[in-house]
Interface confidence: medium
């Protein structure tokens, strides 16, 4: 999906109002210094692409994030403020389910959410710079 046509200000508002709180709740009890942020993004559409990938694509080390409250709110926000997003996601979800292959190994859900917090922070910083 091409995120260039999204309403970035509205997405930022939704993130600050609810999604950020859910992400922080998920991470509560874990020190921010526990994990290094290895995923980055260079502009707003790129940040949303990475956020979508990390939130909704089950990875070999974390399969359950898409069921979390912050993921449901992220999906609703993108569907609301990115034209045509929900239509493209129906097909993408089917394709993703077909090719998903998980292997039991070290659990990385907390690390993944830590990466998401970093991506969202980068999204907001990018937004501030562009205004």
């Amino acid at each position: 999906y091409d995120f260039t046509n999204c309403d970035f200000q509205k997405i930022e508002a939704d993130y600050l109002r609810t999604i950020s709180k859910d992400l922080i709740t998920y991470m509560s009890g874990t020190k921010s210094t526990d994990f290094n942020n290895t995923v980055s993004c260079s502009n707003r559409p790129h940040c949303l692409t990475e956020i979508q990938s990390l939130t909704f694509n089950p990875t070999p080390r974390c399969a359950s994030l898409a069921k979390e409250m912050f993921a449901r709110k992220t999906k609703a926000t993108l569907a609301l403020w990115c034209p045509g997003y929900s239509e493209t996601q129906i097909n993408a979800t089917q394709a993703m389910k077909k090719r998903r292959k998980r292997k039991v190994t070290t659990n990385k859900c907390l690390e993944q959410v830590s990466q998401l917090l970093g991506l969202w922070r980068r999204f907001i910083r990018t937004l501030l710079k562009k205004q």
Epitope: G29, S64, K101, K103, T105, L110
Partner: antibody, heavy 117, light 107 residues
Framework: QVQLVQSGAEVKKPGASVKVSCKAS????????MHWVKQAPGQGLEWIGV????????TYNQKFKGKATLTVDTSTSTAYMELSSLRSEDTAVYYC??????????WGQGTLVTVSS | DIQMTQSPSSLSASVGDRVTITCRAS??????LAWYQQKPGKSPKLLVY???RPAAGVPSRFSGSGSGTDFTLTISSLQPEDFATYYC?????????FGQGTKVEIK
């Protein structure tokens, strides 16, 4: 609602094998791991192994390698655990339980396997 | 393998008491810890996962805390239906292991 229904109690002689079933309903069977957990009489919980129904990938607790074999039948949304070369120390309640990321949100009712001569 | 050690192994308490059960991991498991309740003859029931996140339908009197190697399950006001055995379990890496259990009995 999610349900995991296990087969009934079994009494086996030492050296025999037993196959316990776990029929899943109320969710997409291939979207969750299926684990098996042992509880010997009056004892705690011990993880045996896990199978991914989407591709039948399995991994086992080292202690149960060669003892337990996990399989699935996706057409009936049923998981199976076969225990071979039964000994008295295999007498226990065996549970199937599902998970995505290693914590177990739904459990079967348990199957008591008694090994006695 | 990661060893999980629970304490105490049993405790006696009265209805209305605040009860605390601790669980220690042999190595850092961050917040990858779950708590279960098991009543005699019944299957375990998930109470808490990721150390502090309540499972669906679990009463608010149950709460989890801790990270790293030291974790706590607290029952703020013990109810008659809470007399049971409680297990911790790490969900950091295979093999997943459980604590030996804490039996909560009526005083």
């Amino acid at each position: 609602q999610v349900q995991l229904v296990q087969s009934g109690a079994e009494v086996k002689k030492p050296g025999a094998s037993v196959k316990v079933s776990c029929k899943a309903s109320g969710y997409t069977f291939t979207s969750y791991w299926m684990h098996w957990v042992k509880q010997a009489p009056g004892q705690g919980l011990e993880w045996i192994g896990v199978i991914d129904p989407s591709d039948t990938y399995t991994t086992y607790n080292q202690k149960f390698k060669g003892k337990a074999t996990l399989t699935v039948d996706t057409s009936t949304s049923t998981a199976y655990m076969e225990l071979s070369s039964l000994r008295s120390e295999d007498t226990a309640v065996y549970y199937c339980t599902r998970s995505l990321d290693g914590f177990f949100d739904y459990w079967g009712q348990g199957t008591l396997v008694t090994v006695s001569s | 393998d990661i060893q999980m050690t629970q304490s105490p192994s049993s405790l006696s308490a009265s209805v209305g008491d605040r009860v605390t059960i601790t669980c220690r991991a042999s190595e850092n498991i961050y917040s990858y810890l779950a708590w279960y309740q098991q009543k005699p003859g019944k299957s375990p029931k998930l109470l808490v996962y990721f150390a502090r996140r309540p499972a669906a339908g679990v009463p608010s009197r149950f709460s989890g805390s801790g990270s790293g190697t030291d974790f706590t399950l607290t029952i703020s006001s013990l109810q008659p239906e809470d007399f049971a055995t409680y297990y911790c379990q790490h969900h950091y890496d295979t093999p997943w292991t459980f604590g030996q259990g804490t039996k909560v009995e009526i005083k």
